[in-house]
């Protein structure tokens, strides 16, 4: 039978009564466009939705945009359009919600043709009511905020200025012309690239890296030879271009720009990119695209400083810049990983890291699953799973894999079981560890989301027809129960619940078509009536996260640790609540070989966990900047992974090595610096 | 192979506290919950708590919370069970017996490892 | 707490007898079920766990199954040493027993 069908199934008690008196339909009273919806602030319950309604005529196009604010978690919806002047606001924008739960809000309106700038509304009272601005120029990107303090604003104009307000939107000033792109750092700090002459396309790979520390007052130069920039963790990296020729190279500073190493990465051509996967206080991934239209890479991982990488995986599936790539954080365990490989017959195989890119392997099969038609041998195969890429190709996959950090282990994705990626009808998979084990949770293809931190997983299934069903889980995806949330079917859009699976609201978004119109509806279902008491102590049961084989010493070590979770037993049936916190308990682990990677100039041979140098490193300067000047390079060869917190056991101590290097990097080193004031 | 031996035989006034220890060899300790479960005289097989050494990660059923401490020490491989204020009705054989593991919980597998028991009589 | 109760409390069969005791949960417990043999003045012994995985070195006439709230322990064909008390054990809730099934010859 398929998966939850069984009678077996633990049934939630008089759930349909409980669901249909917590469940509210809103009617919009306008024609079928767009929509878009933000949630503003955090537990708030607010939801501003944006509908847009454009008719192209033959010389320009009529639009009409409507405003509607929720505070009650989609149950209720008011039109707010007066509040904003029924202006038409410009939906490529989106709704620019401000940090944190600061309460802001701000819209960017169509203006029209002749105008000197552009027209904002601002809110800083989570959409209750709005001040319309208008701007000294017509903006290029949405407004950013600053992390630190959501009244500093930056924006990009469509001349190239950047502008910057420290009243949230009330006053502006251009501190910069001639900015190709720009970014809030830490501190209020803000980078921009800059071109001297040509334009950001013509100057691409000579335009220099500024900083300002004070919001326009002094700038610094901390880099000449920019093709891009980009921030990740505590890392500013930087592409440099080489002097002798068109390749460019990755240096890394974690000090704001100040000094600068060079990233020991390979330097790539004028048709390849780098690309940072991802990144924390500890390490980046970085993918190094392969030479010509291979549509693959090379992922490596960092050390600590952004400066040592070590080779992570080949042949990783990366289509074009700013293309496609599966890769995904499983947020819900630490050091889990999962992306997609191009394998040499061109077919696509999902691999997944459980210790943050150190080794990689192919998902486990799914008990009781058969193998697809891509496998060679029907008994022997994995699971692969369906991301970006497939759903960028119109494959039937409606959602990305999902996980959340505060429903541990949980992670729900699309798949197929077989040598590489299906172009079949996927079904829906999930993972209660971290993606050790997988079981199939759903036949074909759904969208899904979770609530509750894990307490309910909803779904609902993708199809060209309208549907009025939605089905739910309190037990991880083991069992399922179908609700009609209304008589009356609607094709469906969207589901929305508040980011952060905290919620027990889930919003059902779609349309109902009628002989001459369509009207967008929302159905919101609150689930607290089912989960009807607090969870207990009795709930929760003990879990040891990354266990394969408890009669290893160290089993569930990772980086140096294991972790001790507190998780919901999949019996109980009840509500972890919006308060809810993740309870851990961490343990340090011995440390052995696998705990440190190979400094600059070592290696480690394959099937084997010990550095040793590089063969044709010895006695030759190295082509590696180590904060922009020359110096001596000491190392014993070892150095511990980022984040690993092993303690005692195996300590590689040895005979340090002095490399005398040789800078032949041609960035900025500080003396080189200059600064300015305006 | 593991094996789970426990202390010997005690008798002990009502009131009184008695403390049973389990210690275990030939096999990782600290990687599986130890349960202690008794056995009243001619009845079932009554569970009343189990722990986690690593972490010591201790919980009770509902009847002996307050009155039962499970602790464990993972340098020697010993886990205890200390029960107070005992009555006549305590008299039983108790059990520690390790949790079976497959994946990374600790209490779903079942008991696959017991200590020989060790028999605790109360009377005045 | 979860309550498990287990059925027949006494049953008299002869060897080369298929045997089946039950056991029912109070509550859903999907497939955390154990099952165990008892001997007089011996500690209990690990048949079943997973309410149908049999435990290394159990005999392979031992079979359970079942899943929820419903299980069952089946001795395909009864051996001498297979006269002592069984009893289910679930590990969803707080771990509880059933009341045990005692098999005695017939």
């Known amino acids: 039978s398929a998966p939850g069908e069984d009678e077996e199934c633990g049934r939630v008690r008089d759930f349909v009564a409980k669901l249909a008196n917590n469940t509210h339909q809103h009617v919009f009273d306008d024609l079928r466009g767009s929509v878009s919806l933000s949630w503003v602030g955090d537990s708030t319950g607010v939801i501003l939705v944006l509908t847009t309604f454009h008719v192209p005529l033959v010389i320009m196009t009529f639009g009409q945009s409507k405003l509607y604010r929720s505070e009650d978690y989609g149950k209720n919806f008011k039109d707010i359009t007066d509040l904003i002047n029924n202006t038409f606001i410009r939906t490529e924008f989106g709704m620019a919600i401000g940090p944190e739960n600061s309460g802001k809000v701000v819209l960017t309106a169509e203006v029209s043709g002749g105008s000197r700038g552009g027209r904002i509304f601002r809110s800083s009272d989570f959409a209750k009511n709005f001040v319309q601005t208008d701007l000294p120029f017509h903006p290029l990107t949405q407004m950013m905020y600053s992390p630190q303090n959501s009244d500093y604003l930056l924006a990009l104009s469509t001349e190239n200025g950047l502008w910057v307000s420290k009243n949230f939107g009330g006053k502006w000033e251009e501190i910069h012309k001639a900015v190709c792109l720009a970014k809030w750092g830490s501190d209020n700090t803000i980078f921009f690239t800059t071109y001297a002459n040509g334009s950001c396309k013509a100057d691409l790979g000579a335009l220099e890296l500024w900083r300002t520390s004070d919001l326009g007052k002094s700038f610094k130069t901390i880099g000449v030879k920019i093709y891009s920039f980009g921030l990740g963790g505590r890392f500013l990296f930087a592409s440099v271009m080489a002097d002798k020729d068109t390749t460019r190279r990755i240096h890394v500073s974690t000090d704001q720009g100040d000094t600068w190493s060079m990233a020991q990465l390979p330097s790539v051509g004028q048709e390849q990119f780098y690309s940072i996967l991802a990144a924390n206080d500890d390490m980046v991934f970085m993918h190094v695209d392969e030479p010509g239209d291979t549509g693959f890479g090379t992922i490596f991982t960092s050390d600590d400083r952004g400066i040592v990488y070590s080779k992570s995986l080949d042949r990783h599936l990366y289509t074009t810049t700013g293309g496609e790539t599966d890769f995904t954080n499983v947020t819900s365990l630490r050091g889990v990983y999962i992306t997609s490989v191009l394998s040499e017959d061109n077919s696509i195989q999902t691999m997944i890291t459980f210790d943050q890119g150190g080794r990689w392997t192919h998902l486990r099969k799914p008990e009781n699953s058969e193998c697809d038609a891509t496998a060679k041998n029907k008994n022997e195969c994995s699971l692969h799973i369906h991301a970006s890429y497939s759903i960028s190709q119109k494959l039937n996959v409606p959602m990305a894999p999902l996980s959340e950090p505060n429903a541990v282990g949980i992670v729900i994705a699309h798949g197929s079981v077989g040598d590489a990626i299906s172009v079949m009808v996927p079904d829906v998979y999930i993972s209660d560890d971290g993606g050790y084990s997988w079981t199939k949770m759903l036949e074909g293809p759904h969208y899904y989301t979770i609530l509750d931190s894990g307490g309910i997983i909803v779904a609902i299934e993708h199809s060209s027809r309208p549907i009025n069903v939605i089905k739910f889980s309190t037990d991880e995806g083991q069992c399922w129960q179908t609700y009609t949330f209304t008589r009356d079917p609607i094709y469906f859009t969207g589901l929305a619940s508040e980011p952060g699976a905290r919620s027990m609201n889930i919003s059902i978004w779609g349309f109902t078509e009628s002989f001459l119109t369509s009207q967008w509806v929302s159905y919101t279902i609150d689930f607290k009536d089912i989960l009807e008491r607090n969870c207990e102590e009795k709930d929760y049961t003990i879990w040891l996260a990354h266990s394969t084989d408890p009669a290893d010493y160290e089993d569930g070590c990772i980086l140096g640790y294991k972790e001790q979770f507190l998780r919901l037993r999949k019996s109980s049936v009840c509500q972890n609540g919006r308060d809810y916190v993740v309870t851990k308990q961490p343990s340090i682990c011995l440390c052995s070989l696998e705990d440190f990677l190979c400094d600059f100039g070592y290696y480690r041979p394959e099937n084997d966990s010990k550095c040793v140098e590089q063969p044709e490193l010895k006695g030759h300067d190295l082509e590696f900047c180590l904060y922009g000047r020359e110096e001596h390079l000491t190392t014993n060869g070892y150095r511990k992974i980022p984040g690993d917190k092993c303690q005692g056991g195996v300590n590689p101590v040895r005979e340090v090595k002095d490399l005398k290097k040789k800078c032949t990097s041609n960035f900025l080193s500080p003396e080189k610096q200059n600064s300015k004031s305006n | 192979q593991v094996q789970l031996v426990q202390s010997g035989a005690e008798v002990k006034k009502p009131g009184s506290s008695v403390k049973v220890s389990c210690k275990a060899s030939g096999g990782t300790f600290r990687n599986y919950a130890i349960s202690w479960v008794r056995q009243a005289p001619g009845q079932g097989l009554e569970w009343m708590g189990g722990?986690?050494?690593?972490?010591?990660?201790?919980n009770y059923a509902q009847k002996f919370q307050g009155r039962v401490t499970i602790t464990a020490d993972e340098s020697t491989s010993t886990a205890y069970m200390e029960l107070s204020s005992l009555r006549s009705e305590d008299t039983a054989v108790y059990y520690c017996?390790?949790?079976?593991?497959?994946?990374?919980?600790?209490?779903?597998?079942?008991?696959?490892?017991w200590g020989q028991g060790t028999t605790v009589t109360v009377s005045s | 707490d979860i309550q498990m109760t287990q059925s027949p409390s006494t049953l008299s069969a002869s060897v080369g007898d298929r045997v089946t005791i039950t056991c029912r949960a109070s509550?859903?417990?999907?497939?955390?079920l154990a099952w165990y043999q008892q001997k007089p003045g011996k500690a209990p012994k690990l048949l079943i766990y997973k309410a149908s995985s049999l435990e290394s070195g159990v005999p392979s006439r031992f079979s359970g199954s079942g899943s929820g709230t419903e299980f069952t322990l089946t001795i395909s064909s009864l051996q001498p040493d297979d006269f002592a008390t069984y009893y289910c054990?679930?590990?969803?809730?707080?771990?509880?027993f059933g009341g045990g099934t005692k098999v005695e010859i017939k």
């Open positions: 722990i986690i050494p690593i972490g010591g990660w201790a």
């Open positions: 509550q859903s417990i999907s497939s955390w």
């Open positions: 054990q679930q590990a969803d809730g707080h771990i509880t």
């Open positions: 017996a390790r949790q079976g593991r497959k994946t990374g919980y600790y209490y779903y597998y079942g008991m696959d490892v």
